[in-house]
């Protein structure tokens, strides 16, 4: 019957002995044997691996690049890689931010419920019955209608989600 | 003791493809990352690519990117090289190694491509 | 790419001490290794990181070195040791090989 060998969690099993794993930082240069540890080399500038791992290479550190509207949020380091996020104006489109897309403005009728953030984009919602928004915005809510009433004004003109209420003085005909 | 046999070279046209193998006994194949390196008529050793244990990660160096595959069946212990688009200068002698880490310490007897019109 | 130079030939007798060197472009630590390749055959792996001894392989050979030169060192020669000898690097992105060194024997 086979042996059953039991590596601890930084080793691994190699030709039935268990070898020691390379640490963040690292990667593999030889295996270990009966006489030798488990050799490893430190991660070359531009490169990184977060986990005690057995591979060959290194991953490279990834590239922000600006011509997708990405930025450098985070600089990678021999353990992490870059963490990138999008320019100004512009949201992640996927959870790695791989690309961005611009904020999409709330058009007339429609007020921000929630502004864009770095990762998500705006949220916007109908304006309900007394309230308007009269143009396209990244943070304008929708705003209620003027009270005529209060302003001991009548009404010229009915609100619409997209035009405030026209106010005038009251007409003197009984 | 440790055996690497290639399989699957010949004489192609440019442009076309061709599929090289490797069948590996000897030693557990899915403990180690393979590669395949080439050898020019007359000529010094190029590494062309690697693959780790489990297929998960592979290599290639800038000239066979996107036309040449690396893969594995660890069931079958064989080693593969899919080689599309062919090019003249892709002309060598694909030696199968196995890699201890990032050097090579068993090599295969090597198959033969030529890449003419 | 880092460029691993070699000179290109050799000639000594049997008995002799001769030293093959190789020279990296860039600094490769000690991620250097050496293999002989004898007319008609694969590779065999000699040296790997540096100095160390592949198992099998006769105590004649050594390697030595670091940072961008390196020696592979084969004391005394043999008529067996007919062959080309070259150089790798597995610091860099693509790993590259010498241009060999074809020892011949007088």
């Known amino acids: 019957l086979g042996q059953c060998v039991t590596c601890s969690d930084k080793q691994y099993l190699h030709d039935g002995q268990c070898c020691d794993l390379c640490q963040p930082g690292s990667r593999l240069t030889s295996h270990c044997t009966a006489l030798e540890k488990t050799q490893c080399h430190p991660c070359d500038s531009g490169e990184f691996s977060a986990q005690w791992n057995r591979e060959i290479r290194c991953h490279q550190h990834r590239h922000c690049e600006p011509n997708q509207g990405l930025r450098v949020k985070k600089e990678g380091t021999a353990e992490s890689d870059t963490v990138c996020t999008c320019k100004e104006g512009q949201h992640c489109t996927s959870k790695d931010c791989e690309a961005c897309a611009q904020h999409t403005p709330c058009i007339p009728g429609f007020g921000v419920m929630e502004m864009a953030t770095e990762t998500t984009d705006t949220v916007c919602h109908p304006c309900p019955v007394g309230f308007f928004s009269n143009q396209s915005s990244l943070f304008e809510k929708c705003y209620p209608w003027t009270s005529c009433e209060d302003k001991n004004l009548e009404v010229l003109q009915k609100g619409t989600s997209q035009t405030n209420v026209i106010c005038g003085l009251k007409s003197r005909m009984r | 003791e440790v055996q690497l046999v290639e399989s699957g070279g010949g004489l192609v046209q440019p442009g076309r493809s061709l599929k090289l193998s490797c069948a590996a006994s000897?030693?557990?194949?899915?403990?180690?990352?393979m590669a395949w390196v080439r050898q020019a008529p007359t000529k010094g050793l190029e590494w062309v690519a690697s693959i780790s244990p489990s297929g998960g990660r592979t290599y290639y160096r800038d000239s066979v990117k996107g036309r040449f595959t690396v893969s594995r069946d660890n069931a079958k212990s064989t080693l593969y090289l899919q080689m599309d688009s062919l090019r003249s200068e892709d002309t060598a002698t694909y030696y199968c190694?196995?890699?201890?880490?990032?050097?090579?310490?068993?090599w295969g007897q090597g198959v033969m491509v030529t890449v003419s019109s | 790419d880092t460029v691993l130079t070699q000179s290109p030939a050799l000639a000594v007798s049997p008995g002799e001490r001769v030293t093959i060197s190789c020279r990296a472009s860039?600094?490769?630590?000690?991620?250097m290794h050496w293999y002989q390749q004898k007319p008609g055959q694969q590779p065999k792996l000699l040296i790997y990181l540096a100095s160390h001894l592949e198992s099998g392989v006769p105590a004649r050979f050594s390697g030595s070195g670091s940072g961008t030169d390196f020696t592979l060192t084969i004391d005394p020669v043999e008529a067996d040791d007919t062959a080309t000898y070259y150089c790798?690097?597995?610091?860099?992105?693509?790993?590259?090989f010498g241009g060999g060194t074809k020892l011949e024997l007088k």
């Open positions: 000897g030693f557990t194949f899915s403990n180690y990352d």
């Open positions: 860039e600094s490769v630590s000690t991620l």
């Open positions: 190694a196995r890699h201890d880490g990032s050097y090579f310490d068993y």
């Open positions: 790798q690097e597995s610091w860099n992105d693509p790993w590259t």
